[in-house]
């Protein structure tokens, strides 16, 4: 703001008074400017924090979107499965021998539920099993498969403790472990295991076992397998047969080293691995450098981490 120029000479007192007023005014303006500058600095800082938060939010959102995208693949078909499962539950009796009982995805298949997706298995008081949400594969090799493990997005850590592996974790439409207690219950009848794998070049392979049993917790969820068939090269689960389950906090392996800590997962570690299907999910570029990845020795060796894996079970006597 410019100082006013007087054409006529003013009286000295008036001049001094005007001067003082102008100085005051200038001081006030400087104070205002300082305040404004301080406010601007604060705003800039707030904006910067906000931008950082937004970037973090965007990163988080993109991860969420990636998860949603992978889920979306099966969403449409799953909507069909939401046809009131209460009808299904009402039809079920609590007797173990009942032909109407729903134990797993094969039971659902026999009741003409032929769409792959998420179903709720009703509780069974006789077997002492709670209600359980499962993902059913109703298409592969005749269908009726209950998926017990899936690795496809890498958004879920599998370096978990004994309790988490016992109860299960992850997202039923994404990456998950169904839970050792549930898998043990599901394998109490003669059961078949199928392991499906995909590498980073898009090749698909499978391994099937004529017999699959998971012992109870007292037996440390020990793995028992029957004969192998498949196209994945060497059988990389046989080495883990008759081996107890180990996690980072429960060392049940046959090794002086703690395999669960070395291989970063929960698994039937021997000393240590021919396969490590619950290992670390490594993305393309990092997928062939690590011993603790999702490995299957008989196919790509001990340092190649696979892109996708699913483990699924169904009764041995299942007929499509």
């Amino acid at each position: 703001q410019k100082l006013s120029k007087h054409k006529t000479p003013a009286q000295p007192q008036l001049k001094a008074a005007n001067c003082c007023e102008e100085v005051k005014e200038l001081k006030a303006q400087v104070a205002n400017l300082s305040s404004l500058l301080s406010e601007l600095n604060k705003k800039q800082e707030r904006d910067w924090v906000s931008v950082v938060m937004q970037v973090m939010e965007l990163e988080s959102n993109s991860k969420r979107m990636e998860s949603r995208l992978t889920d979306a693949e099966s969403k449409y078909s799953e909507m069909n499965n939401q046809i009131d499962i209460m009808q299904l539950q009402a039809a079920q009796t609590v007797t173990q021998t009942s032909a109407d009982a729903i134990y797993d995805c094969s039971s659902l298949y026999q009741k003409n539920y032929r769409i792959s997706g998420v179903y709720k298995l009703p509780p069974d008081d006789f077997l002492g099993s709670p209600e359980l949400e499962v993902f059913c594969d109703m298409e592969t090799s005749g269908g009726g498969w209950t998926i017990i493990q899936r690795r496809k997005s890498g958004l879920v850590s599998f370096y978990r403790d004994w309790k988490q592996y016992k109860q299960g974790f992850g997202s039923i439409r994404g990456d998950f472990w169904l839970g050792n207690e549930h898998i043990h219950r599901l394998s109490r009848q003669p059961t078949r295991l199928r392991v499906e794998m995909e590498d980073w070049e898009g090749n698909l392979r499978y391994a099937e076992y004529s017999h699959f049993v998971l012992g109870n917790e007292l037996n440390s969820y020990r793995l028992f397998l029957g004969n192998y068939t498949g196209n994945v090269g060497n059988d990389a689960l046989q080495y883990h047969n008759n081996t107890a389950f180990s996690t980072k906090d429960k060392d049940n392996d046959n090794c002086l080293d703690k395999c669960a800590q070395l291989r970063k997962g929960g698994y039937w570690y021997n000393c240590c691995t021919d396969s490590n299907l619950n290992g670390v999910y490594y993305r393309l570029g990092e997928h062939n450098k690590h011993l603790d990845g999702i490995t299957w020795y008989g196919w790509h060796g001990s340092t190649y981490s696979l892109k996708r894996v699913e483990m699924k079970i169904r009764p041995e006597d299942f007929k499509p």
């Epitope: 060392d251 046959n254 090794c255 080293d257 021997n270 240590c272 490995t295 001990s302």
Partner: antibody, heavy 125, light 107 residues
Amino acid sequence: EVQLVESGGGLVQPGGSLRLSCAASGFTFSSYAMSWVRQAPGKGLEWVSAISGSGGSTYYADSVKGRFTISRDNSKNTLYLQMNSLRAEDTAVYYCAKVERDMVRGHYYYYMDVWGKGTTVTVSS
Amino acid sequence: DIQMTQSPSSVSASVGDRVTITCRASQGISSWLAWYQQKPGKAPKLLIYAASSLQSGVPSRFSGSGSGTDFTLTISSLQPEDFATYYCQQANSFPWTFGQGTKVDIK
């Protein structure tokens, strides 16, 4: 040069206790698992116990389980075998051994590559 | 526990002979087998590990083979210093176990 020297052997009465030590030198002690093996007079070798490098994992032969305790002090480069409730059949030369590890296709292979000269334990009344 | 059975329990041989010692496991142990040599009053010495890998410093006349349940230690041309007792040992699972030993003495 890698060296293992056992000590602490001697004559002890049945039911008594003894603590064997094994002083290690010439290698990074904490990086290796260690083991105890014994040999009764005129008999073959019998594995007794093993311990991981950190001391977190220990294993025992059924014949000594509950009576013997393997431990290590990595700051002193020393392996120990605490032997309680000793029996006549525990009479033997006790060897300590360094356990080497090799990895093939994701499997770890263990073997005892360096042995001490042994210390004699006699359990007799 | 895995039992290890060696045969023969003793063998008489001459310098220059080819000597073969076998070791059988009561169940499959993959390649988790080591061979040791022991001379009277001395500590055992590692010869072979992982069924067929020769330990550093061990003469090449010693060789190991086998996998699963049946294993062999071969001395291609016996030398005077080779007269000793030989033990196989499995490290497939705990407890680790030794064979009962095979004594190689002079014919």
